[in-house]
């Protein structure tokens, strides 16, 4: 329906109607990340699978070069989960030094980029201090909320450390958006 | 409306419209779990309250025998939270042995079952190593994402250890889905 | 469209249709909290930004005095994330006493208040024991689910300790709802 109005002669329609199945939607799943150069003060962006397995894009929502492209203005629900995992060295020498082989924190940010505006906008952030004491640790950070987006906006997911992202399963790390 | 088209004679309609209130929806809440036999390599499934308190199913979305039944094909947002809790023995004997009375990890999986195929498909997984040191620990795992489902698909929630699930309050542990 | 029916003379319509852009929606973001008196057995409610930055309310969904007001009956998806942060004193005296300067737990509750009913209803709860051992700790709790609400219902977010809420960034702590 793409927003066309239903307006029989006897009735005034005030807002466009559309079929729900026609709305832009995407669910992207994790892939193995290739090391990429990133700016000093910006977390690296993840790239994603967009058509194999559980991943899909539809109705003009496209994925390209780490970005989800918003094809029409409106209110979108945006979500992501990133599962982090790492190894903590347990040797007494390292533990005494107080610097086990683990990050101090893990962070996920869903970011909006608008071509007409130089600075990206952080829409959602999940950040957690890491105090695991076992030799192997893993945990997810989940985010989801509704935002008003404009046609042409681009969305990406940034993380504090790409090397800690669990890319082994499509159900553990994912990113999606749909027009409400 | 169940997908019927609005097509006044002067206007071509390209996709079915439907009333939002007519869409399949469910929000299920936790109940005390009865110990059940489960296969060696598969996490046990939770069963749920589907009509008391905050729980409901509507518009042909039915709950039966641990499964949510998908009544029509389409894109669904599916979510669940499971709150886990446990006791960690603090006795020096156990702590010296390095094996406190707690799991190494906690995991929630939202799984899809298709009748034509015996193997379930894991849609969402939240998994976390447990390194709590206090005597009582508790924490939620939340999951939510959008999936394309087929009429007849069944959804369930599996957990790594049913005995650790907090079933005391309907707001702590829940499972839901709705057609977009 | 506000629910009005499309009913050309030759066709019976069984449920109201409406434009999606016409539905009540809100996304609220964190502000610095002013200390408020709260009842002994009830967690304090957060107040929110509703129009600056990423925050908005639309289509008769209003925010007033810590509450989101539901303008029409229907099924709503409701979500919130609260990021908590604190300092843990590391002095040997405190650590030996086993009572570092941190809470035993952190909790978020999304609560519904109905004027005709004296007791608030807890819709969603995320609660987590805190066992951080570092000097600074921080972590989010995310909640989201679908509920059937009535016109006039009010929603609020309660937390176990307002002083631990991270109010520094709108993407860390937020609260939203939208009619499905």
């Amino acid at each position: 329906l793409k927003g066309q109005e239903f307006a029989p002669s006897h009735q005034q329609v005030y807002a466009p109607l559309r079929a729900d199945g026609d709305k832009p939607r995407a669910h992207l799943t994790v892939v193995r990340q290739t090391p990429t150069q990133h700016f000093k003060n910006q977390f690296p962006a993840l790239h994603w699978e967009h058509e194999l397995g559980l991943a899909f894009t539809k109705n003009r929502m496209n994925y390209t070069n780490k970005f989800l492209l918003i094809p029409e203005s409106g209110d979108y629900f945006i979500y992501s989960q990133v599962t982090f995992r790492g190894m903590t060295s347990e040797s007494s020498e390292i533990r005494q030094a107080g610097r086990p082989n683990k990050p101090d924190s893990i962070t996920v940010v869903i970011t909006k980029v608008t071509d007409s505006y130089p600075e990206p906008t952080q829409l959602l952030m999940g950040t957690k201090s890491v105090s695991e004491v076992g030799s192997n640790w893993f945990q997810p950070i989940y985010l989801g909320a509704m935002f008003s987006l404009q046609e042409g906006d681009k969305l990406m997911v940034n993380v504090s450390d790409i090397s800690l992202v669990d890319y082994t399963k499509e159900d553990k790390t994912f990113f999606g958006a749909f027009l409400l | 409306l169940k997908g019927q088209e609005f097509a006044p004679s002067h206007q071509q309609v390209y996709a079915p419209l439907r009333a939002d209130g007519d869409k399949p929806r469910a929000h299920l809440t936790v109940v005390r779990q009865t110990p059940t036999q489960h296969f060696k390599n598969q996490f046990p499934a939770l069963h749920w309250e589907h009509e008391l308190g905050l729980a409901f199913t509507k518009n042909r979305m039915n709950y039966t025998n641990k499964f949510l039944l998908i009544p029509e094909s389409g894109d669904y947002f599916i979510y669940s939270q499971v709150t886990f809790r446990g006791m960690t023995s603090e006795s020096s004997e156990i702590r010296q042995a390095g094996r406190p009375n707690k799991p190494d990890s906690i995991t929630v999986v939202i799984t899809k079952v298709t009748d034509s195929y015996p193997e379930p498909t894991q849609l969402l997984m939240g998994t976390k190593s447990v390194s709590e040191v206090g005597s009582n620990w508790f924490q939620p795992i939340y999951l939510g994402a959008m999936f394309s489902l087929q009429e007849g698909d069944k959804l369930m929630v599996n957990v790594s250890d049913i005995s650790l699930v907090d079933y005391t309050k309907e707001d702590k542990t829940f499972f839901g889905a709705f057609l977009l | 469209l506000k629910g009005q029916e499309f009913a050309p003379s030759h066709q019976q319509v069984y449920a109201p249709l409406r434009a999606d852009g016409d539905k009540p929606r809100a996304h609220l973001t964190v502000v610095r909290q002013t200390p408020t008196q709260h009842f002994k057995n009830q967690f304090p409610a957060l107040h929110w930004e509703h129009e600056l930055g990423l925050a908005f309310t639309k289509n008769r969904m209003n925010y007033t005095n810590k509450f989101l007001l539901i303008p029409e009956s229907g099924d709503y998806f409701i979500y919130s994330q609260v990021t908590f942060r604190g300092m843990t004193s590391e002095s040997s005296e405190i650590r030996q006493a086993g009572r570092p300067n941190k809470p035993d737990s952190i909790t978020v509750v999304i609560t519904k208040v109905t004027d005709s009913y004296p007791e608030p209803t807890q819709l969603l709860m995320g609660t987590k024991s805190v066992s951080e051992v570092g000097s600074n700790w921080f972590q989010p709790i995310y909640l989201g689910a679908m509920f059937s609400l009535q016109e006039g219902d009010k929603l609020m977010v309660n937390v176990s300790d307002i002083s631990l809420v991270d109010y520094t960034k709108e993407d860390k702590t937020f609260f939203g709802a939208f009619l499905l």
């Epitope: 994790v30 892939v31 194999l52 559980l54 899909f56 890319y167 499509e170 | - | -």
Partner: antibody, heavy 124, light 107 residues
């Protein structure tokens, strides 16, 4: 048992059309994509088209785009290849093949289940 | 499109021989490469996926290696049932493309 069975091949005149079918059984049809691959007599394998049975996304070999259309019917666990404006060089055995995906970001998998093939002959 | 070039086009070998087939991509395909075996009149069979992973039921004498643009399929000790044509396929970019094939014949 996981199985793919092609049908619909035959003799057709140049410029004609043919619709091939592929019936799938023994697995979750909506999870794995499916490709059509063809092999002309005495030649190697040539990838033709792919469809996501999950959401209907498609890809085609560049030379065939516009003439060939891949589609699916999830309710019937079936896949189709509509071939129009056929030419002599389209003569081949046509296979449908399941695109295994391991649900892991580490792997792209391969075509792990193949049908027996159906022969298409374009000749006047 | 990514071009896949196999070498040799054909080879003759004896039972027990170690056989190596190479596949070169015109641009990097990461590790997204599969190997197939095809016998006359039969459908192809998946041997190796993602450059080095053996498919279910494939004997351990088959192994794959490589990443980027250069890949190798090795049969450590050729068996009578291994005489067939072998194809590589890149799965990095659409359209998927196959190599032209390598025919392994009995010496």
């Amino acid at each position: 048992e996981v199985q793919l069975v092609e049908s619909g091949g035959g003799l057709v005149q140049p410029g004609g059309s043919l619709r091939l079918s592929c019936a799938a059984s023994g697995y979750d049809f909506t999870y794995y994509g499916i490709s059509w691959v063809r092999q002309a007599p005495g030649k190697g394998l040539e990838w033709v088209a792919w469809i996501s049975t999950y959401n209907g996304n498609t890809h085609y070999a560049r030379m065939l785009q516009g003439r060939f259309t891949i589609s699916r019917d999830n309710a019937k666990n079936s896949l189709y290849l509509q071939m129009n404006s056929l030419r002599a060089e389209d003569t081949a055995v046509y296979y449908c093949a399941r695109e295994n995906y391991y649900g892991s970001g580490a792997y792209r998998g391969g075509m792990d289940v193949w049908g027996q093939g159906t022969t298409v002959t374009v000749s006047s | 499109d990514i071009q896949m070039t196999q070498s040799p086009s054909s080879l003759s070998a004896s039972v027990g021989d170690r056989v190596t087939i190479t596949c070169r991509a015109s641009q990097s395909v990461s590790s997204y490469l599969a190997w197939y075996q095809q016998k006359p009149g039969k459908a192809p069979k998946l041997l190796i996926y993602d450059a080095s992973n053996r498919a279910t039921g494939v004997p351990s004498r088959f192994s794959g290696s490589g990443s980027g643009t250069d890949f190798t399929l090795t049969i450590s000790s050729l068996q009578p049932e291994d005489f067939a044509t072998y194809y590589c396929q890149q799965r990095s970019n659409w359209p998927w493309t196959f190599g032209q094939g390598t025919k392994v014949e009995i010496k």
